[in-house]
């Protein structure tokens, strides 16, 4: 069974998938469509790296540009380094500027909805 066929079988169960499952799925060549991606739990999507989302969505990653104002895409973009976002070739803006340090202050982030940054 190839990645696409596997994805069709598990698609209906993905809504509540934790981050670890999504990370594992990103290694399976599933090419998840954007509509399914946007139904995932925001807290499960946020920790994914640009490389992992790129692998998870495959060719559909191109659609992130059109959905950059919608959750969880918007929130995910804010968590990524701008350098990494640039590799997607979509002109996405709003990532963490180069040279900034991301502090994993869970309480701060829970309250503000954005990561805490220390300038260069």
């Amino acid at each position: 069974m190839n990645g696409s066929e596997y994805f069709v079988k598990i698609q209906s169960f993905l809504g509540g998938a934790p981050t670890e499952d999504l990370k594992a799925l990103s290694q399976q060549n599933v090419s998840m469509d954007l509509a399914t991606f946007m139904k995932l739990r925001t807290d499960a999507v946020l920790p994914l790296t640009v490389a992992e989302v790129q692998k998870l969505l495959g060719p559909h990653v191109e659609g992130l540009k059109a959905e950059e104002r919608h959750r969880p895409v918007r929130d995910w973009i804010l968590r990524q380094r701008q350098d990494d976002l640039d590799t997607l070739g979509l002109g996405l803006q709003g990532g963490i500027p180069n040279g900034y340090l991301v502090l994993d202050l869970s309480m701060q982030e829970a309250l503000s909805g954005t990561p805490c940054l220390l300038g260069p």
Epitope: L34, H60, K65, L88
Partner: antibody
């Protein structure tokens, strides 16, 4: 203004390969993926695949996986599509088109495969 | 693969008339999270390359005349041309960009009487 420039025609013999070009101007080349589309008279439009000019990632329609190879040259803002083992079935107009919405298209290259 | 079916395959109308063409997809193109339908309409005039008219089923691209109206959701979509002009002579294609391979309808050829 946005422009995608393609050569008008290519004439090649069966069994040979050809590399079609698409020179982009008027926008940031690495901010939009490039798509390639085939059009044969009376057969509609077929999506061949796309390429991320930023990192060279490519994705193909399964039907064209062994036929087309997509590449880019960032320094010249040019996308390329190589077609191999050409037959008369490959005679068609080939378009490059910008981005997910295909909002700008090249004028197309008419490829004729004939001995 | 998602199959896109357009109808009619051709139609002939007089200048000033209203035209409606249909596009149906074999599965829903609606992203329920953003309420966007991943469907576009293109116009291809004789001897020219396709031109984007409408995206997300109903959003007109810049510079497209107001007489072109896209509508529909899910699997059923319509392109309406109010008061057809002579320059609207063209083939009209719908295309889904919900999932790869991205697929096009067979087209509707608009002829002017």
């Amino acid at each position: 203004q946005v422009q995608l420039q393609q050569p008008g025609t290519e004439l090649v013999t069966p069994g040979a390969s050809v590399k079609l070009s698409c020179k982009a101007s008027g926008y940031s080349f690495t901010s939009y993926w490039m798509h390639w589309v085939k059009q044969r008279p009376g057969q509609g439009l077929e999506w061949i695949g796309n390429i991320n000019p930023s990192n060279g990632d490519t994705f193909y329609n399964e039907k064209f996986k062994n036929k087309a190879t997509l590449t880019v040259d960032k320094s010249s803002s040019t996308a390329y599509m190589q077609l191999s083992s050409l037959t008369s079935e490959d005679s068609a107009v080939y378009y490059c088109a910008r981005g997910w919405l295909r909002d700008y298209w090249g004028q197309g290259t008419t490829l004729t495969v004939s001995s | 693969d998602i199959v896109m079916t357009q109808s009619p395959s051709s139609l002939a109308v007089s200048v000033g008339q209203k035209v409606t063409m249909s596009c149906k997809s074999s599965q829903s193109l609606l992203n329920s999270s953003s309420q966007k339908n991943y469907l576009a309409w293109y116009q291809q005039k004789p001897g020219q390359s396709p031109k984007l008219l409408v995206y997300f089923a109903s959003t007109k691209d810049s510079g497209v005349p107001d007489r072109f109206i896209g509508s529909g959701s899910g699997t059923d979509f319509t392109l309406t041309i109010n008061s057809v002009q002579a320059e609207d002579l063209a083939d009209y294609f719908c295309q889904q960009h919900y999932t790869t391979p991205y697929t096009f309808g067979g087209g509707t050829k608009l002829e002017i009487k």
